[in-house]
């Protein structure tokens, strides 16, 4: 059987300051069991952008309906984009465990921020 893939279809996204950015991510399987998280940057210094379980992420909303069954769309929307939000965003699948372990990452989507139109 085919192993789960994490698909980030957009290599880059450009958004005007003050607008919302949609970062697309889908997975190809419901298993292995475990959560999806979003990060900006890679490596040990990466910044957590969204985690469904813990944390407060007031600018982030999930694109898929909160009651959708067998959901494989883990796209997010980030509101009120500023130049400080620029960077590469990764959608990462974790395998459930104690603790959860990283299973597979998407290729990343580079977010660039354009000046707010005057």
């Amino acid at each position: 059987e085919e192993e789960l893939q994490v698909i980030q279809p957009d290599k880059s996204v450009s958004v005007a300051a003050g607008e919302s950015a949609i970062l697309h991510c889908t997975v190809t399987s419901l298993i292995p069991v475990g959560p999806i998280q979003w990060f900006r940057g890679a490596g040990p210094a990466r910044e957590l952008i969204y985690n469904q379980k813990e944390g407060h992420f007031p600018r982030v909303t999930t694109v898929s309906e909160s009651t959708k069954r067998e959901n494989m769309d883990f796209s997010i929307s980030i509101s009120n984009i500023t130049p400080a939000d620029a960077g590469t965003y990764y959608c990462v699948k974790f395998r459930k465990g104690s603790p959860d372990t990283e299973f597979k990452s998407g290729a990343g989507t580079e977010l660039s921020v354009r000046a707010k139109p005057s």
Epitope: P32, V33, G34, I36, S66, K68, R69, E70, N71, G97
Partner: antibody, heavy 120, light 108 residues
């Protein structure tokens, strides 16, 4: 229609072994996690074990004694039960996992169950 | 481990009446709670998931509410086939998945 059919239950002595099977049909078996839940006579429901794709999870009460596995080519779930104890006596149900949005798993289809009795 | 406490353990109701029973979680499970019905001699059946969403084919007289640590299942106008045991289950933090001890709804 989704169907789950357990088999392999029976009477076994303490310390003995048993292998339960659950034949699944009506859904894409290999795409879903599947679970064993048991119910002791007159008691409530107790989660036993879940398997995804090679990832396995166990209740503390059965860890090291029970092994969950699956054969996707046969659409079948298994539970190998070793070192059985009297307290393992229960009806064992297999269940198909379901998820909602970004959340964890619940169980949307259940088999009829198979009775395991551990007694000397 | 998250402990789910259901109350009452037994509820005596007349057919046609309303039944309400609760499930309390030992810690916040957000909306990650399901309800199951188990009739005598049968397997459990999923009624409600995400605390309030009715499973396909479940009659409208069943409704779930609550979030966090306090949840309620309500059955309006009990039918004869509704006399059964009802279990809640949390799937917010696992393993282990945990179930409540059940509420038995019996005929008054």
């Amino acid at each position: 229609d989704v169907q789950l059919l357990e088999s392999g239950g029976g009477v076994v002595q303490p310390g003995g072994s048993l292998r339960l099977s659950c034949a699944a049909s009506g859904f894409s078996f290999s795409n879903f996690a599947v679970t064993w839940v048991r119910q002791a006579p007159g008691e409530g429901l107790e989660w036993v074990s879940t398997i995804g794709s090679g990832d396995t999870y166990y209740a503390d009460s059965v860890k090291g004694r029970f092994t969950i596995s699956r054969d996707n080519s046969k659409n079948t779930l298994y539970l190998q039960m070793n070192s059985l104890r009297a307290e393992d006596t229960a009806v064992y149900y297999c269940a198909k996992d379901s998820t909602v949005s970004w959340s964890g798993d619940f169980f949307d289809y259940w088999g009829l169950g198979t009775l395991v009795t551990v007694s000397s | 481990e998250i402990v789910l406490t259901q109350s009452p353990a037994t509820l005596s109701v007349s057919p046609g009446e309303r039944a309400t029973f609760s499930c309390r979680a030992s810690q916040n499970v957000k909306n990650d709670l399901a309800w199951y019905q188990q009739r005598p001699g049968q397997a459990p059946r999923l009624l409600i998931y995400a605390a309030r969403i009715r499973e396909t084919g479940i009659p409208e007289r069943f409704s779930g509410s609550g979030s966090g640590t306090e949840f309620t299942l309500t059955i309006t106008s009990l039918q004869s086939e509704d006399f059964a045991v009802y279990y809640c289950q949390q799937y917010y933090d696992w393993p282990p998945f945990t179930f409540g001890g059940g509420t038995k709804v019996e005929i008054k």
